[in-house]
């Protein structure tokens, strides 16, 4: 007995061909002997089947001796063993139809779950595999289950169900509702302008919700809000903004945010959090400032970094042409009685300069 | 620790007027919007105004509207409601607030103040 | 102004048992919900902010979920202090507006 596995919705193909090419009488049953469609003369004939609306045939072909059944917007309970009656014989072919849904919206927030569930025929044992846009295989039974979804499982999972040695591939699209990037870092003198991007890793047709830019300065006891934000078809309007320091904030996506300067009392980290609209929970990026200073007091050239840094940045004090340095993996280095001439201050990460700040020591007469 | 600490309740009869003071600690005051909250005895709650850091904006609930003025003084870390016309339907606890939560949640409650206006 | 409608306006349970408040916004507050606890004599405490989020020390027992219209408030397994009573709040527009509160009592 032939087995073909069908897909839930689609459209699938029984043959039977005959041994003279040549149109003949054929009849297409299922295992309660109840007719389908068949010939009756030149004509196609159907009968008291539940299919009979959805069945039929490829008439241009029975002249060749193909008798095919198609069936067409496939249900699950469509599965069954079909016969197909021609020149005295009887050519069984096994259908299995199967179904595979994710068991909410397809779109996900970073972190979700997703289940998929597998709808099958009473009886079959199949096993599925999906593999992930990102190339992460995962196997399952009834239901396939990823516990936290990430930003790279966005797109089409591709699932494999297989039963009798026969396949049968799903494809599902899955968009991961997400920031694009979880974490940034911007590094900036004093004084200067902040600018902080927030892009998408993903797009809605339309991008409804709200939304807020929580912040910890490293010199404040307690974090904060900053902006309070509203998002209406991805038009930004904000709400209520902190006075100290006053955030500016762009009316289009990407979101983004301008402070008119960097300050020692800024420096720190932020969340920024977004609920969109019929979704529970939020989209979040994480925002660092770090800000430098170099200054010059009395005989004293200091150069201090605020906000978070790693402990493996160095952050160094250089005369221009000249080979005098200090460096030191720490917040503030200094150099007591510096020679006159341009000096250079360096945070940098494994030699990659991440911020530079210049400063001129006048000679002292 | 933040601390809210309201004062000024009391028993005040209809027409009459009462100043409600909250005297805020353990937090930067003038960084924060303020706002008043009452509850009527056995009732829910009622917003019922709140003003911004500087004390630049104020809002009212509609019912006390042209009756209540809202102010700060940031240099003493002090939050007032001025309460004139008073009617017997003002008669409730008053919350001093901040909204400091996230999201503009209404994050420190102080311990809240009785105004009786009865006659 | 908008109207914050709660529901049920008291419900029963026991020790241990799942409880599910509701509240329904007059018109679209996107995720600018807040959910409070009062004990009675005492000051409401936040509980939930931004619809979904958890203020920091509150027990994982409590979430929130939903947005724009309706949201929900439940208490996955009730704990005899969790006998008193919930309030929703919207932060969208002046004038913020309560729900009328919900009290969970012992059955």
């Known amino acids: 007995k032939k087995v073909v596995l069908g897909k839930k919705g689609d459209t699938v193909e029984l043959t039977c061909n005959a041994s003279q090419k040549k149109n003949t009488q054929f009849h297409w049953k299922n295992s309660n002997q109840i007719k389908i469609l068949g010939i009756q003369g030149l004509f196609l004939t159907k009968g008291p089947s539940k299919l009979s609306d959805r069945a039929d045939s490829r008439k241009s072909l029975w002249d060749q001796g193909c008798f095919s059944m198609i069936i067409k917007n496939l249900k699950i309970e469509d599965s069954d063993t079909y016969i197909c009656e021609v020149e005295n014989k009887k050519e069984e072919v096994e259908l299995l139809v199967f179904g595979l849904t994710a068991n909410s919206d397809t779109h996900l927030l970073e972190g979700q779950s997703l289940t998929l569930t597998l709808e099958s025929p009473p009886g079959s044992s199949p096993s599925v595999k999906c593999r992930s846009p990102g190339g992460k295989n995962i196997q399952g039974g009834r239901t396939i289950s990823v516990p936290q979804l990430e930003r790279q499982d966005s797109g089409t999972w591709t699932c494999t169900v297989s039963q009798d040695q026969k396949t049968v591939e799903f494809k599902i699209d899955i968009v991961v509702l997400a920031f694009q990037k979880a974490s940034s870092t911007v590094y900036k003198k004093e004084g200067e302008q902040v600018e902080f991007s927030f892009p998408l890793a993903f797009t809605l047709e339309k991008l409804t919700g709200s939304g807020e830019l929580w912040w910890q300065a490293e010199r404040a006891s307690s974090s904060k809000s900053w902006i309070t934000f509203d998002l209406k078809n991805k038009e930004v309007s904000v709400k209520r903004v902190t006075q100290d320091p006053k955030l500016q904030m762009g009316k289009k996506l990407p979101l983004h945010l301008t402070l008119p300067q960097a300050l020692p009392q800024y420096a720190g980290s932020g969340n920024l959090t977004l609920a969109l609209e019929a979704k529970t929970g939020k989209l979040h990026q994480e925002v660092n400032l770090v800000v430098m200073r170099a200054t010059q007091f009395q005989e004293n050239l200091t150069c201090e970094v605020w906000g978070p840094t790693s402990p493996k940045l160095t952050l160094s004090l250089k005369l221009e042409n000249k080979g005098a340095t200090v460096s030191k993996q720490a917040k503030a280095v200094w150099v007591l009685n510096p020679e006159a001439g341009m000096w250079q201050c360096l945070l940098s990460d494994s030699g990659q300069v991440l911020l530079e700040s210049n400063i001129k020591v006048v000679p002292t007469w | 620790e933040v601390q809210l600490v309201e004062s000024g309740g009391g028993l005040v009869q209809p027409g009459g007027s009462l100043r409600l003071s909250c005297a805020a600690s353990g937090f930067t005051f003038s960084s924060y919007w303020m706002s008043w909250v009452r509850q009527a005895p056995g009732k829910g709650l009622e917003w019922v105004a709140n003003?911004?850091?500087?004390?630049?904006?104020?809002y009212y609930v509609d019912s006390v509207k042209g009756r209540f003025t809202i102010s700060r003084d940031n240099a003493k870390n002090s939050l007032y409601l001025q309460m004139n016309s008073l009617r017997a339907e003002d008669t409730a606890v008053h919350y001093c607030v901040r909204e400091g939560g996230q999201w503009l949640a209404l994050d420190y409650w102080g311990q809240g103040t009785l105004v009786t206006v009865s006659s | 102004d908008i109207q914050m409608t709660q529901s049920p306006s008291s419900v029963s349970g026991s020790v241990g048992d799942r409880v599910t408040i509701t509240c329904r916004a007059s018109?679209?507050?996107?995720?600018?919900l807040a959910w409070y606890q009062q004990k009675p004599g005492k000051a409401p405490k936040l509980l939930i902010y931004?619809?979904?989020s958890l203020q920091s020390g509150v027990p994982s027992r409590f979430s929130g979920s939903g947005s724009g219209t309706d949201f929900t408030l439940t208490i996955s397994s009730l704990q005899p202090e969790d006998f008193v009573t919930y309030y929703c709040q919207q932060a969208n527009s002046f004038p913020w507006t309560f729900g009328q509160g919900t009290k969970v009592e012992i059955k």
């Open positions: 931004g619809a979904s």
């Open positions: 018109q679209g507050i996107s995720s600018w």
């Open positions: 003003i911004k850091e500087d004390g630049s904006d104020k």
